[in-house]
Interface confidence: medium
Amino acid sequence: MRTEAQVPALQPPEPGLEGAMGHRTLVLPWVLLTLCVTAGTPEVWVQVRMEATELSSFTIRCGFLGSGSISLVTVSWGGPNGAGGTTLAVLHPERGIRQWAPARQARWETQSSISLILEGSGASSPCANTTFCCKFASFPEGSWEACGSLPPSSDPGLSAPPTPAPILRADLAGILGVSGVLLFGCVYLLHLLRRHKHRPAPRLQPSRTSPQAPRARAWAPSQASQAALHVPYATINTSCRPATLDTAHPHGGPSWWASLPTHAAHRPQGPAAWASTPIPARGSFVSVENGLYAQAGERPPHTGPGLTLFPDPRGPRAMEGPLGVR
């Protein structure tokens, strides 16, 4: 049992979960909805869950619905990375995963989505109104960031109502092309949804083991231009922020710690290990449509005995940044 913040809670049907007819009738609304919501721009969804059994444990799941190749995912809390947020994890498709306390496990769920389990106690423990942000970079198209949080009133074990659309920060100025076809699609969608209201929805039983299990996703359009949608970043209860973060920046140091942009994130304490991550299953939901992960089996191993992640003597030197050629 868990509390979830979905933004809003919409579930696109997954293959194999319904009969062909039901599947076909349900797919169209979701396709149209995605069109209506994204309006031609890539999209990041964020889902935050609090485990009922461990109140200090959170699971953050994020995904990218654009067509570019994902090159780097940064998960932060306390606001967007680069706007006061503290970096919790960085996931690179080739160079591996790095995470900092209180992040316990970061991993690729599919080739376009990630999950991060957080746990902690006291000052480093997340709390219900903490904002979690995910930033997906795709070079050279741009980078997109969305944020989400649990409603402060959420009771563990109860399904949380959908929260408002997540805070978005699309750093790529995109095109908000709303065509007549799109408008028609949106109107048609509303018509379908009204009709669908009067029919009982089939209950889907999520499987805890299958990567194809139904997943409530937070859907929201990426902001095409920062000027186009002025949504203030959420403020968080500072008591939920890590209390022992060192912000000093020793210049010129060779370590990756010294390379964290201080304006973007506090430097987390403690050792950070590269996490071993499984290659996403071929059957998993994939929204990246091109080269980088064309064959899941070709992704290089992230870690392992004898694998030097950073043969460059200077090593990777900062937390943020894109890559992923179309």
């Epitope: 750093d171 390379s259 080269g291 030197r317 940044g321 894109p322 890559l323 050629v325």
Partner: antibody, heavy 120, light 106 residues
């Protein structure tokens, strides 16, 4: 030690094509993007495009589409840039540079540059 | 595309002086990077991700800024700092550079 070794200077006639190379060493070639940057005499820098050795599909600055073609040979850890239909405007120093995505996508290592002169 | 405007184009300073050069973008960017280039040489990474000094860069250099306005500051200029400094962004395609600020010593 990370090194990007570029091919030597080129003198070519207008209308011709040229292919310049950049051989990488000292790091895992496939982990980084390779970029090409143009610097006309006494002028600023212009990003031409980038290629990821693991994908092969390059990405271009729209301005250079049709002018530059980027390719990669993973077996020799070399990236190439072919410039075609050359004019005097293409005379410049061309740099290959490795990008560091963790650094906010900046160029952490540069080749020594290849001088291209287009003249009849 | 995002256009970066550097000012001043030419900066003349005496050794020991504090100097600041700016880079303005016509649209908000994530980070700004800075490169130093001396005549006949390749550009060198100087400051990355707005405020981080690249390897080997003296601590007298610093970078700051956010959104559309960024700056590179040298607390006490030395003779070896004479060079052209370029800013660079990658927030949207294409990646772009500023026209450069040439720092010369009096």
């Amino acid at each position: 030690e990370v090194q990007l070794q570029q091919s030597g200077p080129e003198l070519v006639k207008p209308g011709a094509s040229v292919k310049i190379s950049c051989k990488a060493s000292g790091y895992t070639f496939t982990h980084y993007y390779k970029n090409w940057v143009k610097q006309s005499h006494g002028k600023s820098l212009e990003w031409i495009g980038a290629i990821n050795p693991n994908i092969g599909g390059p990405s271009y600055n729209q301005k250079f589409k049709g002018k530059a073609t980027l390719t990669v040979d993973k077996s020799s850890s070399t990236v190439y840039m072919e410039l075609r239909s050359l004019t005097s405007e293409d005379s410049a120093v061309y740099y290959c540079a490795r990008s560091d995505d963790y650094g906010g996508y900046y160029f952490d290592y540069w080749g020594q540059g290849t001088t291209l002169t287009v003249s009849s | 595309q995002i256009v970066l405007s550097q000012s001043p184009a030419l900066l003349s300073a005496s050794p020991g002086e504090k100097v600041t050069m700016t880079c303005r973008a016509n649209s908000s960017v994530n980070y700004m990077h800075w490169y130093q280039q001396k005549p006949g040489s390749s550009p060198k990474p100087w400051i990355y991700a707005t405020s981080n000094l690249a390897s080997g860069v003296p601590a007298r250099f610093s970078g700051s800024g956010s959104g559309t306005s960024f700056s590179l500051t040298i607390s006490r200029v030395e003779a070896e700092d004479a060079a052209t400094y370029y800013c660079q962004q990658w927030t949207s395609n294409p990646l772009t550079f500023g026209a450069g600020t040439k720092l010369e010593l009096k």
